[in-house]
């Protein structure tokens, strides 16, 4: 019969390694995106990052982040996003709800969307790593 699997006990060092990898990849993405000159960040787009009512790593809004990055991948062929998505999937529960993103249609606005979300993603991964390491320190004290 089709039984649900035993809940996976994942060591914290694995989670930290995933987030460290995401942090590194987010910097690569941002560096790539910033090569486009004359594009300014927009106040119109906000990437969900950390949820205050959950413990790390479940406090990372991984499904929403995945949806935003998937949108960037469709707008601009950044292959680093493929690897980012694979790592985000390690943090996403298989029954997590889908997130719908409204995509800008104007070419320049698309570039602003890509830059803004890439910048926010990079900052988000810095925060996520901080929240993981501070959480780990609290757990040991």
């Amino acid at each position: 019969s089709h039984t649900l699997p035993v809940r996976l006990l994942r060591p914290s060092d694995d989670v930290q390694k995933i987030v460290e990898e995401l942090q590194s990849l987010s910097k690569m993405l941002l560096k790539d995106v910033e090569e486009e000159k004359g594009v300014l960040v927009s106040q119109n787009y906000t990437l969900p990052c950390l949820s205050p009512d959950a413990q790390p790593p479940n406090n990372i809004h991984s499904p929403a982040i995945r949806a935003y990055l998937k949108t960037i991948r469709q707008l601009d062929n950044k292959s680093v996003i493929d690897e980012i998505i694979e790592h985000l999937d390690k943090l996403i529960f298989q029954d997590a709800p889908e997130t719908n993103i409204s995509v800008p249609t104007d070419t320049h606005e698309c570039k602003r969307f890509i830059l803004t979300i890439s910048q926010q993603f990079s900052e988000c991964m810095d925060l996520a790593l901080k929240s993981l390491t501070s959480g780990a320190q609290q757990a040991t004290t």
Epitope: H2, P5, R7, L8, R10, P11, D13, D14, K17, I18, K70, D82, E83, I85, E86, H87, D89, K90, L91, I92, F93, Q94, D95, A96, E98
Partner: antibody, heavy 122, light 107 residues
Framework: QVQLVQSGAEVKKPGSSVKVSCKAS????????MQWVRQAPGQGLEWMGA????????RYSQKFKGRVTITADKSTSTAYMELSSLRSEDTAVYYC???????????????WGQGTTVTVSS | AIQMTQSPSSLSASVGDRVTITCRAS??????LAWYQQKPGKVPKLLIY???TSAEGVPSRFSGSRSGTDYTLTISSLQPEDVATYYC?????????FGGGTKVEIK
């Protein structure tokens, strides 16, 4: 009960294409990656590629890039692997495999199709 | 691509022997490693996932462990029905490559 049923054996001429199907039943996951693997006679398992059926997102082994296309039809819970420009070295058993678990990313492939034998011969 | 180096490529042991098979990853892949058993003419069967978690219905004599980038599949007491080829596969990032396989035979 999860079942993966693959299409039947194929005999193909060099230079032609083959399309193998893999139909899943009893599988309730929404976010997952499934993979295609092949095994030439007397050889080991070789990873060909993967698909995230919900979005049609694909990943391919560098070895097969440009020759393999993996697709999925969500409405029929069927995945497909098409291999073109066939040569004799492509004679193998082709498998589809699906994961189980609580995350979207796999950490093992729990369910396997029965395999599809593809023979390439002139 | 991450390389998985599996050793030995074949081994012969007596019934009741303790058997160990190793896979070494070319870089850190965390616990994202699975072990499969494939009997002649059969479909691969998942034994261990996430480096050390046993799949449902797998006999307790099979276990997995990890030390850094080295992963070990242990059969604590080899049985005649364990004659098969064993493969490791990583899931850190695509391509999800396999080890070359270890053929286990009974002496």
């Amino acid at each position: 009960q999860v079942q993966l049923v693959q299409s039947g054996a194929e005999v193909k001429k060099p230079g032609s294409s083959v399309k193998v199907s893999c139909k899943a039943s009893g599988y309730t996951r929404t976010r997952y990656w499934m993979q295609w693997v092949r095994q030439a006679p007397g050889q080991g398992l070789e990873w060909m590629g993967a698909i995230y059926p919900g979005e049609g997102d694909t990943r391919y082994s560098q070895k097969f890039k440009g020759r393999v296309t993996i697709t999925a039809d969500k409405s029929t819970s069927t995945a497909y692997m098409e291999l073109s420009s066939l040569r004799s070295e492509d004679t193998a058993v082709y498998y589809c495999a699906f994961p189980e678990g609580q995350y979207a990313a796999p950490y093992g492939m729990h369910y396997w199709g029965q395999g599809t034998t593809v023979t390439v011969s002139s | 691509a991450i390389q998985m180096t599996q050793s030995p490529s074949s081994l012969s042991a007596s019934v009741g022997d303790r058997v160990t098979i190793t896979c070494r990853a070319s870089r850190n892949i965390g616990n994202y490693l699975a072990w499969y058993q494939q009997k002649p003419g059969k479909v691969p069967k998942l034994l261990i996932y996430y480096a050390k978690t046993s799949a449902e219905g797998v006999p307790s004599r099979f276990s997995g462990s990890r030390s850094g980038t080295d992963y070990t599949l242990t059969i604590s007491s080899l049985q005649p029905e364990d004659v098969a080829t064993y493969y490791c596969q990583h899931f850190w990032k695509t391509p999800w490559t396999f080890g070359g396989g270890t053929k286990v035979e009974i002496k």
